[in-house]
């Protein structure tokens, strides 16, 4: 175009519907110029105007010829332009921030603006740029893009931004612009102008302030603190660590903490100091709640449910910032909150939830929440299967009879719909405890009763009880122990009885043993002894316990002696024994040796012995009647070990084995023996009966049984040359090759002739006895042989 004609035609649109075209006027033209603008379209359109721009409806795709005729005082000039959408620029109108507000507690800015979408014909994507500036110097803090869509109507947009610095610390400015990314427009697209700026500031009072206050943040986060002050701030510390100051407007300063460490439970102080003062805030750095661990729900009483859990990792937040828990039951919609006052016991938290009528299945969700986040755990329980009964209380024992008792106890709760399995521990003194399981129907009123039989009369029992439900979840704790003595019953057996004739053979002495407690069935008060023959029965006076012996004057006829034990309830069956022994002529005395503690006796089975066997023993050296003790063994036995605290090593005892038939006893074997053999305590006394030139005759005596201390097995006789009162070695000293030893194993031998000796020579003689328990001491003598004749 010529300079004297309109030139530099440019078209822009702000809404894609109208193009605003403008051009430069021909040089030299003044105010009074008119223009004719013709657009070569399907229809030829011309417009008369007095200004250098024209708004035309947006042209569809393609090239259009635009003729601009300039009419002025000194003539006219015409310019032709080709116009295409591609030459048109899309520049949106300058946006306007409708509202900028702040939440100072969260340091968040809230922005509100209108996209004026109603003026656009198509749906288009819009890119917004939001600029955040800080301080009076308007330092750029953040430039963000935000995408929206135009949808044919005016839409209000909201955007928020959380500042890393508390908003109180400095003035914050915000401005926005937009860019319409229309797919239907092929021309140039450009950013709008920036909106008029809006700002947010905090109006300080005269007091110095530190921000943020009481902030709770995640461990490892970064955080900015500031001090709004009229006086110069000299230093800042977190805990006791100095931090570099960041200068803001005026005397205001900030500090930035990176990767903050976990706080003490009371928080961490952030302190700013001035010449004369100190100002602080507290930061609580911790963790969001961990997922509640080991959530478990049970009931003690089917009235309320107890849910327990472990909080997991500690949050380091306490007091008002501590984790709060809510237990929600989803079927009923009911919930309970955990009160912080209910401090956890041993790291485990618990909540009670009231059971709901006719609801057995509960779906619990435990929500954990603190200022840093939330978490949850869920559990589905059939509560009838999760009964952990209370400890049974008011546990009582009452007698039914001598072998049965009634146990009662209290178990709080409404258990009408379930059965209990209860375990009763029964302990007899000094014996192993027994456990019995009983199934009991649950009741509403909490009182339970059970009968316990198969007990022993007159026995001290200790009872305790615990219960679980039949479906078994947990045993209750054991109840308190209750000690109880069952009532007496008639003694179940007669006493173990034996008899001996007195040494003069005129009196029969009857002995019996106290009944063991499990047969006495009570405290034995007395004994009745009676004596009967074919002609008569004679009863002795009642013999009070603890006397266990009676003497009756009897002739040598056969009598049956009866002994009956009596307690407060009644009398035992009689124990019967014949006064006379069944004779046995075919008896030899045998030797037996024990095993240190006792002695094993064996015998052959005898089918004639129908009642029992009795082993009787006594100390051999004691006078008649020979009775130390006796032991009864069943008739089918062929051996027994006799043990007694009274047995001593080296003491000889007589043992007698009797067999019984029809209450009469026959002596089957007679034995002498030792529990343990020892060496003799003395040497045999010996004398020289005769001396010749070449021989000596020695004679010795028996060693008394008490000193022998075992069965005599032989003698050791030593002889050799030797003189009294000389330094020559004694016979038994080692290393002598001229000493001779004779081992005499024939214990009936009482003399010994030593031959082949030298005449008129002194000999040293030594004699020792030995048993299987060892060799006894020595007895020695010096003898001089006669001179050879």
């Amino acid at each position: 175009q010529k300079k004297g004609a309109p030139h530099d035609l440019k078209c822009v649109t702000n809404n894609l519907q109208v193009w605003d075209c403008y051009w430069k006027a021909p040089s030299g033209t003044g105010r009074g110029t008119d223009y004719e603008v013709c657009i070569e379209n399907r229809s030829h359109s011309c417009y008369q105007l007095e200004k250098t721009n024209i708004k035309i409806p947006a042209l569809s795709h393609g090239d259009y010829e635009i003729t601009i005729n300039s009419l002025h005082d000194f003539g006219s000039s015409t310019s032709k332009f080709t116009l295409n959408e591609q030459n048109v620029s899309l520049i949106p109108d300058t946006p306007e921030i409708l509202n900028l507000s702040a939440d100072f507690s969260t340091s968040t800015l809230y922005l509100k603006w209108n996209d004026r979408g109603s003026v656009f014909p198509h749906h288009s994507n819009v890119i917004w740029e939001i600029k955040i500036l800080r301080k009076e110097s308007m330092e750029l803090v953040k430039l963000v893009t935000h995408n929206t869509t135009l949808n044919g109507k005016d839409t209000l947009h909201h955007w928020s931004w959380a500042s890393d610095m508390p908003l109180e610390c400095a003035i914050h400015f915000v401005e926005i612009r937009c860019y319409i990314d229309s797919l239907h427009f092929s021309g140039r697209k450009e950013w709008s102008d920036w909106s008029p700026v809006k700002n947010i500031s905090w109006m300080p009072d005269s007091q110095t302030k530190v921000f943020p206050q009481d902030k709770v943040i995640l461990v490892g986060s970064d955080i900015t603190f500031c001090c709004i002050s009229q006086e110069k701030v000299l230093s800042a510390l977190i805990g006791h660590t100095n931090c570099p100051l960041i200068h803001l407007d005026g005397e205001n300063v900030a500090i930035k903490i990176h990767n903050i460490s976990v706080s003490a439970s009371s928080g961490t102080n952030v302190v700013f100091t001035t010449e004369d003062n100190i100002f602080g805030t507290v930061i609580f750095a911790g963790y969001p709640p961990d997922t509640p661990q080991q959530l478990n729900c049970e009931t003690h009483d089917l009235k309320e449910i107890l849910c327990r859990w472990n909080p997991g990792r500690a949050t380091a937040l306490v007091g008002p910032r501590a984790t709060s828990y809510t237990l929600l039951e989803s079927f009923s919609g009911k919930y309970v909150r955990f009160k912080r006052a209910e401090a956890p016991t041993n790291g485990s938290y618990q909540l009670f939830f009231q059971m709901l009528p006719n609801q057995e299945i509960y779906n619990f969700t435990l929500n954990a929440h603190n200022p840093l986040g939330r978490s949850e755990s869920t559990i589905l329980v059939n509560i009838t299967e999760k009964v952990y009964p209370h400890t049974p209380t008011s546990f009582k024992v009452k007698d039914i009879n001598s072998t049965a008792v009634k146990l009662s106890w209290h178990l709080p709760g409404n258990f009408a719909k379930i059965n209990f399995l209860c375990q009763i521990e029964i302990k007899k003194s000094n014996t192993v405890q027994e456990q019995r399981n009983v199934t009991i129907k649950g009741v509403e009123n909490s009182s339970y009763l059970v009968a316990l039989d198969k007990l022993n009369p007159y026995t001290v029992y200790t009872f305790r009880i615990r219960c679980s439900t039949e479906t078994f979840w947990k045993w209750s704790k054991w109840s308190n122990k209750k000690q109880h003595l069952t009532t007496e019953a008639i003694p179940s057996k007669g006493p173990d009885t034996w008899r001996e004739w007195s040494s003069d053979g005129k009196n029969l002495i009857i002995y019996w043993k106290p009944l063991p407690i499990n047969e006495a069935n009570g405290k034995i008060l007395s004994y009745n002894v009676s004596c009967s023959s074919d002609e008569e029965t004679q009863s002795l006076s009642e013999i009070p316990d603890p006397q266990h012996k009676a003497e009756i004057q009897l002739d040598k006829n056969d009598y049956i002696i009866s002994v009956v034990a009596k307690n407060s309830v009644g009398s035992s069956p009689p124990s019967k024994i014949a006064s006379m022994e069944i004779p046995n002529d075919d008896l030899k005395i045998e030797q037996v040796v024990g095993m240190g503690k006792g002695i094993l006796l064996t015998w052959h089975y005898d089918p004639n012995m129908t009642c029992d066997y009795v082993i009787k023993w006594c100390n051999s050296s004691r006078s008649e009647p020979c009775l130390m003790d006796w032991r009864k063994v069943p008739s089918n036995s062929t051996e027994t070990v006799i043990e007694s605290d009274q047995f001593r090593p080296g003491v000889r005892y007589n043992f007698f084995l009797y067999g019984c038939r029809n209450q009469g006893y026959q002596l089957l074997r007679s034995m002498i023996g030792y529990i343990e053999e020892l060496a003799p305590t003395v040497a045999p006394n010996f004398t020289v009966e005769d001396t010749s030139a070449d021989s000596i005759l020695v004679k010795w005596e028996d060693i008394p049984v008490e000193e022998l201390r075992g069965f005599l097995r032989g003698y050791l006789f030593y002889f050799g040359k030797g003189e009294r009162d000389t330094s020559k070695m004694r016979v038994l000293e080692s290393g002598r090759s001229d000493i001779k030893v004779k081992n005499i194993t024939d214990i009936s031998q009482k003399t010994l002739r030593i031959a082949d000796l030298q005449g008129k020579t002194s000999y040293h003689l030594v004699l020792r006895a030995y048993t299987d328990g060892g060799v006894g001491p020595e007895k020695s003598m010096y003898v001089v042989t006669k001179e050879n004749s």
């Epitope: 102080n269 952030v270 100190i278």
Partner: antibody, heavy 125, light 108 residues
Framework: QVQLVESGGGVVQPGRSLRLSCAAS????????MHWVRQAPGKGLEWVAV????????YYADSVKGRFTISRDNSKNTLYLQMNSLRAEDTAVYYC??????????????????WGQGTLVTVSS | EIVLTQSPGTLSLSPGERATLSCRAS???????LAWYQQKPGQAPRLLIY???SRATGIPDRFSGSGSGTDFTLTISRLEPEDFAVYYC?????????FGPGTKVDIK
């Protein structure tokens, strides 16, 4: 157990000086900020001064600024208050008090716990 | 400086009753920086509550603290004979550290 024992109180004439001491035991003295608090007869509590755990920073109430000096000797576990130019209105029981939490744990602004039994200062002509 | 006001000045109650003591600040105080002390005649003050609501070691749970901003409360749920004393609130968040004038709890 933690103990604070004040000493040095007494009767003094206006304009004169007095030095109070506070002997600390049962804790790591060098880890705690320390304070002086006073209580005029029949009146409430008035904070007087604080000194940081390391002795580097000291702060005072306006009523004593320029006249009183707080100091500490961490080797002797002792806190001091040097009181100069005493006035009748300084008459009070003077308590020393420890920060309730160690500076190493929580930092430098804390509640006061425990307190000493107090020492009476009487300023009178 | 932050001025603390306590009310009432005197509270006359009987043992077993509930006591509610108020402390108001002239400007906002961080709840982390508010403490309550008890003082009996002839004795040094004793810390009850710190951080507005945390009970000090050995303090019975009948004592509780609450509040934020400018209004704080000390509650004694059931007064015991040994609780009759003067109670002071204190802010320790900025110097000068200030105490309230005290509330005297006496036996009715």
């Amino acid at each position: 157990q933690v103990q604070l024992v004040e000493s040095g109180g007494g009767v003094v004439q206006p304009g004169r000086s007095l030095r109070l001491s506070c002997a600390a035991s049962g804790f790591t003295f060098s880890s705690y900020g320390m304070h002086w608090v006073r209580q005029a007869p029949g009146k409430g509590l008035e904070w007087v001064a604080v000194i940081w755990y390391d002795g580097n920073n000291k702060y005072y109430a306006d009523s004593v600024k320029g006249r009183f000096t707080i100091s500490r000797d961490n080797s002797k576990n002792t806190l001091y208050l040097q009181m100069n130019s005493l006035r009748a209105e300084d008459t009070a029981v003077y308590y020393c008090a420890r920060d309730g939490e160690s500076s190493m744990v929580r930092g430098l602004l804390n509640w006061f716990d425990p307190w000493g039994q107090g020492t009476l200062v009487t300023v009178s002509s | 400086e932050i001025v603390l006001t306590q009310s009432p000045g005197t509270l006359s109650l009987s043992p077993g009753e509930r006591a509610t003591l108020s402390c108001r600040a002239s400007q906002s105080v961080s709840s982390s920086y508010l403490a309550w002390y008890q003082q009996k005649p002839g004795q040094a003050p004793r810390l009850l509550i710190y951080g507005a609501s945390s009970r000090a070691t050995g303090i019975p749970d009948r004592f509780s603290g609450s509040g934020s901003g400018t209004d704080f409360t000390l509650t004694i749920s059931r007064l015991e004979p040994e609780d009759f004393a003067v109670y002071y609130c204190q802010q320790y968040g900025s110097s000068p550290f200030t105490f309230g004038p005290g509330t005297k709890v006496d036996i009715k």
